[in-house]
């Protein structure tokens, strides 16, 4: 069998809401994957499990089952959404995300995804990890690849 390639493309959109009383941030993050089947037979994408971390703390998980099948030498683009919650010991981020005086409300999140494919009763798992920027201050739609992680530092003005 030839390889099945999984490529994490990036964040497609992030929709944010807040609970003012609980100082809690809710982020629905939609990600995009490209899955390429390099075989001369069809494969099933059985499930996708995803996890999102902020500062090494898991803030969201998702699992999609029985997603699709990919034909021979074909590629499919799959979107999946991970609901995340930044709360409790991380609730200091509420102020970072909502203070008007802060001009940039991006946070760096680690996106982890595992794709399980099956063919002829054989199962294969492929995992990817990427750091991505997500804006926690407003609803944002990204051009693919736009949220890739870089690093610069400045104080709140």
């Amino acid at each position: 069998p030839r390889s099945i390639d999984v490529k994490y493309i990036g964040v497609k959109s992030a929709y944010v809401s807040y609970d003012v009383q609980k100082r809690t941030i809710y982020l629905n993050i939609t990600n995009t994957l490209n899955i390429t089947n390099n075989n001369y037979y069809s494969v099933e994408v059985e499930n996708i499990t995803a996890q999102v971390q902020f500062a090494k703390t898991v803030i969201g998980k998702a699992r999609l089952n029985n997603i699709t099948h990919i034909g021979p030498l074909d590629m499919k683009q799959i979107d999946y959404t991970v609901p995340t919650v930044i709360a409790e010991e991380m609730s200091y981020m509420y102020d970072f995300c909502t203070l008007i005086s802060i001009k940039v409300h991006n946070i760096v999140l680690m996106m982890q995804v595992t794709v399980t494919t099956t063919y002829f009763g054989h199962s294969e798992q492929i995992s990817q990890e990427r750091y991505q920027y997500v804006d926690c201050g407003r609803n944002t739609t990204y051009q693919l690849g736009q949220s890739e992680y870089l690093n610069v530092l400045q104080p709140q003005q």
Epitope: R23, A55, K56, E89, Y94, F96, V104, N106, N151
Partner: antibody, heavy 125, light 107 residues
């Protein structure tokens, strides 16, 4: 010049309450959150909690819930901390401190970049 | 809560020397640690934030390093005004917690 001006020493009786002001100047009061810190005699620093002057939203160290109440008066750019049901354990110096967030392309952390001079509270009958 | 163990609690040194103060967190706090200086009659001063970034206006003889659980404040070529109390503080998660402090005295 950023300044956080706190009131002078307080001598209070056990069971009483005290309200400590922290008047901010030299910056826009609502642009930064305010933290409060306790320093008991001969001891280290303990974080009490923090308040966002925009909406009055607070987060407390569990240890100080029910003991401390944080409020702000935006019109006078003043943060307050009220301590109630005072005991000898509450005798300490209390500091207010401005919390600054650091960021570039994204969140990079924070710190207390300006501190008040501290208010000494002595609980004694 | 994240416990911060600061060492040593007391340090005697001479002007011109280089000293290090350590802080260890009970769990990973990424790079989210700040260092402060406390001197009698003065307001507390922020020295370092995000583990290693020097606060504006602080002399370059102060430096910070570390991430995860182990952090170090280094003061090279000690000046007379550096003899003071030093504290580290984590801000990776609520409640913020401080180290026990290090008293730096002139030998």
């Amino acid at each position: 010049e950023v300044q956080l001006q706190q009131s002078g020493p307080e001598l209070v009786k056990p069971g009483a309450s005290v309200k400590i002001p922290c008047k901010a100047s030299g910056y826009t009061f609502t642009d930064y959150t305010m933290d409060w810190v306790k320093q008991s005699p001969g001891k280290s620093l303990e974080w009490i909690g923090h308040i966002n002057p925009n909406d009055g939203g607070t987060f407390y160290n569990q240890k100080f819930k029910g003991k401390a109440t944080l409020t702000v008066d935006k019109s006078s750019s003043t943060a307050y901390m009220e301590l109630r049901s005072l005991t000898s354990e509450d005798s300490a110096v209390y500091y207010c401190a401005r919390w600054v967030y650091y960021y570039g392309i994204s969140y990079e952390g924070g710190a207390m970049d300006y501190w008040g001079q501290g208010t000494s509270v002595t609980v004694s009958s | 809560d994240v416990q911060i163990t600061q060492s040593p609690s007391y340090l005697a040194a001479s002007p011109g020397e280089t000293i290090t103060i350590n802080c260890r967190a009970s769990k990973s706090i990424s790079k989210y640690l700040a260092w402060y200086q406390e001197k009698p009659g003065k307001t507390n001063k922020l020295l370092i934030y995000s583990g290693s970034t020097l606060q504006s206006g602080i002399p370059s003889r102060f430096s910070g390093s570390g991430s995860g659980t182990d952090f170090t404040l280094t003061i090279s070529s000690l000046e007379p005004e550096d003899f003071a109390m030093y504290y580290c503080q984590q801000h990776n998660e609520y409640p913020w917690t401080f180290g026990g402090g290090t008293k730096l005295e002139i030998k």
